[in-house]
Every structure is written in C-alpha cells, then in structure tokens.
C-alpha cells in the first residue's frame, strides 16, 4: 500500500484510488542545504544536481560517520522525500544540493549564510522558474540567519524549514523563528506530535503548520536501491517543500504570501492532540497538518486569511505586544488575549506605512498577546476609524462611513486599569451591522476596507450564563476576518481566530460573579470577495490541463514494494 | 603557517594605506549591537559575522573589513577575513579575538555583529 505519509498528504478525493501525481513540481527547482548526498541513488538519480558548494565545519571525532553512507544519510533521505521516484512528494521537481552539514549533521550559521548567498547569486546569474529552498536544520536564535532568510524571501524565494526537534518553542531557534520562512513541525501516523524520549517536535507561534515526520520511508544512502525510515522535523519540512513545489508548478506566479495561505487553507484542521503541547503553547500552536490541494483552480476565488500571534508582551504595566502581517497581506482585524485577563485591549496603528496590531498589558497582568488577522485582498484600500471613549452610558461606537468601505474588524482599547463588570453589557442596535460597539470607557477602532466585490457580514453568538469559551464560525464560502468580544469587560481574557472560527475566552467560571456579569458575546465578521470568485471563474473557463487536479488524474501510479526495484 | 604570514603581510600593507583613527566614525546615536547564541554549547567564539547597514556597497564592506584588520594589527591582533558578504546582506565573516569586539562595533557602517554558532540536522 501507499506509505502512510504520502496517503496523509493526498487529498481525500484521491485516496481511495491511490493517485500519485506523475510529474508534479516539474517547473520548480528545490535547493537543499544539508549533508552531502548519494546522487546516484535510483530514487533521485537525474533529479538532483550536486552543486560545488560546500561549507562545513570539521568533524569533532576523527572517524565519526566517516563512512560515506552515514555522511550522506540525512540529505539523501530528504532529497528522496521531496522528489523521489517512488516515495517522493513532488516526483517532477528538480533539486540542487548544497553541503552545509558535516558527517555529524553539524554546520554553522556562517556556512548556512554563505549557502543562502550562493543561491541568491545563482538566481541572479541564471533566473529560472519558482525556487524553493529547504533548510532541514536548526540552531539557536540567530538575528543574522533570520535576516538573510528575510532577504531571500523578499527576492521571491520560498524558504521551508524544520521547526526543530527540541520539544521547545520554535521561536527560540533559527531559521525556524524567521517570519518569512515556512516553519514545519512533525506529526506521526496518528496525527500526534512526534516524540522521542524527552524530545520531540518544536511548537508555538513560529510554527506555520505540521506535516508527516515520523517513520518516513525514503532513500537510504546505504546502497543505490536501499530505502529506510527516518524521523524528524526535517522530514516534515521536506513534505511541505514537495507540496510547495507542486503548488508552484501548477501556479508559478504564486507569491510567498499566497503560497503560505494556501498551505494553511488546504491543511487538515484540528486533528492534532493539543494536550501534548505545554498548556501555555496550545493556543499559539497551529492545529494544521499539511496536505496537497484537491485542485488549484477554484482556490483563487477564496478570500484567504490566517492568524498571526505576536510574541508575549512581558508583564510590565505598560508592556505592549505587536503582531504584523507579511508585506503583501492586509491586516483586516486585531484582537488581544491575556491569560490573567488583565489587559487594556488592542488597537490597529500605522507603523512604517503598514498597519500593525498592538495589544496593551494592564497593571498586575502577566502580559498580553496581539493577534492579527492577515488576509490576501488584492487592490484593497483599508483604513482604521477610531472613536474615543463615549460620554454617554450607551457605550462607544464607530462605523465605516466612506462609500464602498465595509467593516472587516473591530478593536477596543482602554486606558483605565479595569473596565469593571458592573456596567450593563452593551448591545448592538439592530440594523446597523457596519459599526463597532464597545464599552463607554474604551476607544473603539474599526477596520474599514474597500476592495472590488468585497462584502462582509457580522455574526454573533451570545451566551447569557458564564462560560469559559464562546465560539462563532463563518459559513462555507465566507472567511473570518474579524473576531472580538462584547462587552470588553474584565472577565474576558480575549478573542482570537482559529481557522474560520472566532473564539472568545473568559475567566474560569468559578471566579466570575453573577450570571449577568458573565454574559459574553462572540462577534465574528465574515467576508467574501465576489470579485475573486468572478476572476477565478474566468480563469477556469480559459485554462485547462495545468491544475493539480489534472496532474492527479493524468496517471495512476501503483506503490511498489521497494525490493521489486532491486534487480 | 604560510597562510598566516601571507595574511600578516597584507595587514602591513593595509596599515600604510589606512588613515589612523576613525575617519568615518559611526553616525551619532546609532550604536551597533553584539549578539550571540543563547545556547552556550552551540557557540563558536572566535568567528564573527559583521553585518553592515542595509545600503552598504561591496567596496565599503571590503574597506570596513580592511580597516578592522588594520586597527587590530595596530593592537597586536591578527585577524582573518573569511568571506565578504554581498547579494543578501552586506558584511563580512571574520576570525578574530573576542577582545576586538568593542573596536569592531565602532567601525563605520556596522549594524550589528553576531558570533558564529552551530546548526544541526533535524
């Protein structure tokens, strides 16, 4: 049967027939920065070009893994996972390998930097199609390595990296912590985070998604027809590099932001058992397992959004946390969250010509997170409308008054240390959906956007009795752009988007006062773009044979037992 | 040993061509910072990536590297430029004593300096 990992990333509609794309990724070049590789292995022969780049430190032990097979083990396996004939994800992708890791699997930040520079220079000398760079390595947090990754990403290169195998916050490692890089954690056949003893996959807000990374069968450097299972976040990253190659081959014009949004969108949602992660990391860690899209056309019409968490603000009274979107994403809403519930809300503000989401800690608070909702909205013109705290007891309100602008998100920020829970909850007047309403002592910020064909609606779910979590989801075809709570009282810990669901968290019910004080409403703003839908339909009408679905349906490949190929 | 002698000759030449002192002192108020790996066993002291400000040209990177070598030589330290970066980040990779960090941070165009560290297969 098909190996579990390839089955897992295959869209459900193809699983029964075991379709495998015959030449997916053929327009894409994947650079691999790793150990040396056995390029004559039959899985990757003719698919991997070994560059003359080598920058590795001396082995610490004079004979450690000096036998070629062990020196080549890691890189050969990963090359096979990306593009191997039998066990590869993107069987059509061509690869180039750079040696930055020695026989012990050890390299340096400087060697990796020089390798990335080599790729950039190669790209300038001989521009090719889309480039994917796979970095199946990790070191401690490095400002310079992250900066180099950022520059390369801004030059149009897609970088995919391993989250790390330290059972730790991926933000403490590089290049995993670089925002521009697609950072991949590892899951097993049961969709559980990969564990090994006290270690295992990294997690946290710096991880973009997870992918198969345990007992992955692939090319073994022991012989040219050998296969072996390996485990680690490198294997997971190799799957995503392969998926990215497939997507880029089908749609070569995809930007990094578009690719990342699609990877997130087509992932399996909420299948990972979050109990494995430390409690404080669960909310920050994406519950996503990578998968190939069922097809690429039909995706274009969708309004894609993702949730970006900031770093923790720290506990000082005036501490703030900032969440940012990628350069070609729009910040459509901003929310905040604090485990202690002591926060002073959030606001959208301009920074360097771009909107950012800033959350404010409160006195006695343990710190806050800012949560940005980052979306792909071509030709968007967004602005923030602010209303200062109201004098009247009815509360503060602000709406989108410009013609053609729609409300995509609401934020509220207050200077007082505690809004208190004794004031009656504020209810939105009926028939005025295009406005944000909040506590009278808070300033309210409305995100108002104009984009071709953009339409939005407000969806609320109120619970009269105290409850630790209130959720409201957008319907099929609509995308969650905004998530906030009504009222913004002190027992509300905050609000955040998980996929297409708005989650409002409140303090433990046992610490909440009476039921009227415990009333919480989750407010979701759901949007869609008629313009994108139209454009996609036109594209589908004029294009044929270039989508992933066409590649999938082009050929059915049987999975052979490996030993059939040895003679 | 031959390598080092060659390097030292180069330094002497650099000494003659460089003006003494900091002709292009860093702009007032902008202090370059030093970074190193938080995980001690992964640190590689003695090798440093000197990152220059964004718009620094290759010629300026090379000049800054030579200046560091000249000023280090004046203090009796041997340094070795291992690589000059351009294309992604402006800067250079240098093998030198940690004693020279303070000096290096004061060089013109320097944005920050990072001590080299290990990365590992995952």
């Amino acid at each position: 049967s098909i190996p579990w990992n390839l089955e897992r990333i295959t869209p459900p509609r193809y699983r029964a027939d075991e379709y495998q794309p015959p030449d997916g990724g053929s327009l894409v070049e994947v650079y691999l920065l790793d150990t040396s590789i056995q390029s004559d292995h039959r899985e990757i022969e003719g698919r991997v070009m070994v560059t003359d780049f080598e920058n590795v430190p001396e082995e610490d032990g004079t004979r450690f893994h000096r036998q070629a097979s062990k020196c080549d083990s890691h890189g050969t396996h990963l090359a096979g996972v990306v593009s191997g004939r039998d066990a590869g994800v993107a069987k059509g992708a061509s690869m180039r390998s750079l040696r930055v890791l020695n026989c012990q699997g050890k390299g340096t930040v400087s060697g990796t930097l020089i390798g990335l520079e080599f790729i950039r220079k190669s790209q300038l000398v001989q521009p090719v199609g889309p480039l994917v760079v796979l970095l199946p390595l990790a070191g401690g947090y490095s400002r310079v390595l992250n900066a180099a990754c950022q520059r390369l990403a801004r030059a149009g290169v897609v970088l995919v990296t391993a989250a790390g195998n330290f059972r730790d916050d991926a933000c403490l490692y590089s290049p995993a912590s670089a925002p521009e890089v697609i950072t991949v954690g590892a899951t097993n056949a049961q969709d559980q985070p990969v564990t090994l003893g006290t270690l295992g996959t990294n997690f946290g807000r710096c991880v973009d998604l997870f992918a198969p990374g345990e007992d992955i069968i692939g090319a073994s450097s022991d012989c040219s027809t050998c296969f072996v299972s390996q485990s680690g976040t490198s294997q997971a990253a190799a799957h995503v590099a392969g998926i990215a190659a497939m997507m880029l081959s089908a749609e070569p014009e995809l930007t990094l932001a578009e690719l990342r949004q699609r990877l997130i969108h087509f992932s399996a949602k909420d299948v990972i058992n979050e109990a494995w992660f430390p409690e404080d990391q669960r909310v920050l860690t994406p519950n996503l397992v990578a998968a190939l899209p069922p097809s690429t056309h039909g995706a274009g019409w969708q309004l894609f959004c993702r949730t970006v968490w900031s770093a923790h603000s720290g506990p000082t009274r005036m501490a703030t946390a900032v969440a940012r979107c990628a350069p070609d994403e729009e910040l459509l809403s901003c929310s905040s969250f604090s485990r202690s519930g002591k926060r002073r809300g959030e606001r959208m503000e301009a920074q360097g010509g771009k909107l950012v989401c800033r959350a404010h800690n409160a006195f006695g608070g343990e710190g806050v997170y800012a949560i940005a909702r980052c979306c792909l909205l071509p030709q968007a013109n967004c602005s923030v409308h602010t209303a200062p705290p109201a004098e009247a007891s009815m509360g503060t309100r602000v709406h989108c008054h410009q013609q053609g602008h729609v409300l995509t998100g609401c934020s509220s920020h207050w200077e007082v240390e505690d809004l208190g829970t004794h004031k009656p909850p504020v209810l939105r007047p009926r028939g005025q959906p295009n406005q944000c309403v909040g506590h009278r002592e808070a300033s309210i910020h409305a995100s108002c956007c104009h984009a071709p064909g953009l339409e939005c609606k407000v969806k609320e779910h109120g619970i009269p009795a105290p409850q630790e979590q209130v959720t409201v989801a957008c319907e099929e075809g609509w995308t969650l752009t905004g998530c906030s709570a009504l009222p913004g009282t002190s027992h509300v810990l905050g609000a955040y988007a998980v996929d297409n669901t708005c989650v409002v968290r409140s303090r433990d019910v046992s610490t909440t006062g009476s039921t009227s004080e415990g009333a919480v409403t989750a407010v979701a703003i759901c949007c869609r773009s008629r313009h994108l839908a139209q454009a996609s339909q036109e594209l589908q009408g004029s294009t044929s044979g270039s989508g992933l679905n066409d590649i999938f349906e082009a050929q059915k490949i049987e999975w052979h037992e490996h030993h059939h190929h040895h003679h | 040993q031959e390598d080092e002698d060659g390097d030292y000759e180069e330094l002497v030449l650099a000494l003659r061509s460089e003006e003494d002192g900091l002709a292009e002192a860093p702009e007032h108020g902008t202090t370059a910072t030093f970074h190193r790996c938080a995980k001690d066993p992964w640190r590689l002291p003695g090798t440093y990536v000197v990152v220059l400000k964004e718009e620094t040209h290759l010629s300026q990177s090379e000049r800054t590297a030579r200046r560091l070598q000249a000023q280090a030589a004046r203090r009796g330290y041997l340094t070795k430029i291992l690589h000059v970066f351009h294309g992604l980040l402006p800067g250079f990779l240098v093998k030198m004593s940690g004693d020279l960090l303070e000096l290096a941070l004061k060089l013109p165009h320097v944005d920050y300096i990072e001590e080299d560290s290990s990365v590992f297969a995952q």
């Epitope: 032990g61 004979r63 893994h65 396996h77 090994l196 007992d215 296969f227 485990s231 | 297969a121």
Partner: antibody, heavy 121, light 107 residues
Framework: QVQLVQSGAEVKKPGASVKVSCKAS????????IHWVRQAPGQGLEWMGE????????KFNQKFKDRVTMTRDTSISTAYMELSRLRSDDTAVYYC??????????????WGQGTTVTVSS | DIVMTQSPSSLSASVGDRVTITCKAS??????VAWYQQKPGKSPKLLIY???NRYTGVPSRFSGSGSGTDFTLTISSLQPEDFATYFC?????????FGGGTKVEIK
C-alpha cells in the same frame, strides 16, 4: 505494538551451521535496518553486522565476515542470520535489534528476545 | 576497532544511592554513544541515545553526559528495579562496539 520475535534455542555440533530467524511486526519491515548482536555466557555484547531489508544491503564485523550470511524475506517480514563453521566459542545468545534513525541519531530501539545457540560436540 | 572501556565492572549500592558508570572510548566518538540496561535472561533495553538524550519511557533518574572520549551514565537515586547490567555502545564508526558492562548489585 512493535516487536521482534526470534526462533527457538539451537544445539549444534562444531563445524555445523545455524540459521536464526527474527520476525518483525507492528511496523514497516522494509524501513528499518536489522542488526545482529551476540552475547557469550557471562560476557559483553558483540556486534556482528546489519541488513537493510529494503534491499540485500549488508555490512559485517570483519571478525565474522567469512562465516556470516544475513538475508531477509520481506513477504513474511523476517530477517535471518546464518553462522557457519561453528566453534565452541560461538556458544552465545544471539539477538536481532532494530535500528532507528531520528534526526541525525542512530540507536537500537527494539530488541528480539534472543536465541540461545549452544555449540558442543 | 574503537574500544569502549567501561568502569567499574561491578558495583554494590543501596536503594536511594547515586550511581555513576563511566565509559572511555579509545578515540573520539563525538556523542555517538548509547547506554543499555540488561537484566538476567532478558534482552538489552535502550536508556540513552546520543550520549545524553533519554529514550521514551525511561525514568528521569537516568541521565547521560559526555562527548569525545569520556561518557557517564548516572542514576540519581537507585531503585530496586535498577539492579541490572549496564552497557555503553558507540556507533561512531564500524564495527559498532560495546563496553564490557557494569553489573549493579544490591549492597
């Protein structure tokens, strides 16, 4: 669960051969190298060699190179170790072990229960 | 071949004692060392891989350290079930070799 089950005890005469089997279950047999390790009575462990079941790839300790043969039958997920020209000092418990690769680490995570081979005239 | 010299070959200790076993490699093996526990009539069981990483399900009282040529296995507080023989193994280069073993007995 993942396990390796070995064949039963054997008594052999000097000069004869013995073939020990190791049946794998609970995982993809072709994905993991099988190593053979022996332990003479009251002694330490001695590595004999390895086979990668996805192929016929083998690697041996030079000490046994001329006398040992390692094979596998993927249809029944079983690895075999045959030792020929037996001598009395080959009397030992023979273990098979699965080698796992995680990140850039190698280790034996699962062992068979052992097969006692007695060589006596 | 790389020789792994383990010491002591046997030791007597009481429940609750801190026990340290050392292993010396004849040449640098970086951190390519594993430690196994073996009870009479049973097969070895993996405790530590890559010199210092505790394997799944192994109690936290077991720890490993070292790199290069000198390695240590420490049992912080000996429990009744820990009385067994312990082996180190290098997988730095072929042939893989084991230490002679350390038998931990009840005092």
């Amino acid at each position: 669960q993942v396990q390796l089950v070995q064949s039963g005890a054997e008594v052999k005469k000097p000069g004869a051969s013995v073939k020990v089997s190791c049946k794998a279950s609970g995982y993809t047999f072709t994905g993991y190298t099988i190593h053979w390790v022996r332990q003479a009575p009251g002694q330490g462990l001695e590595w004999m060699g390895e086979i990668l079941p996805s192929s016929t790839y083998t690697k041996f300790n030079q000490k046994f190179k001329d006398r040992v043969t390692m094979t596998r039958d993927t249809s029944i997920s079983t690895a075999y170790m045959e030792l020929s020209r037996l001598r009395s000092d080959d009397t030992a418990v023979y273990y098979c072990a699965r080698e796992r690769i995680y990140s850039n680490y190698w280790f034996f995570d699962v062992w068979g229960q052992g097969t006692t081979v007695t060589v006596s005239s | 071949d790389i020789v792994m010299t383990q010491s002591p070959s046997s030791l007597s200790a009481s429940v609750g004692d801190r026990v340290t076993i050392t292993c010396k490699a004849s040449q640098n093996v970086y951190t390519a060392v594993a430690w196994y526990q073996q009870k009479p009539g049973k097969s070895p069981k993996l405790l530590i891989y890559s010199a210092s990483n505790r394997y799944t399900g192994v109690p936290s009282r077991f720890s490993g350290s070292g790199s290069g040529t000198d390695f240590t296995l420490t049992i912080s507080s000996l429990q009744p079930e820990d009385f067994a023989t312990y082996f180190c193994q290098q997988y730095s280069s072929y042939p893989y070799t084991f230490g002679g073993g350390t038998k931990v007995e009840i005092k």
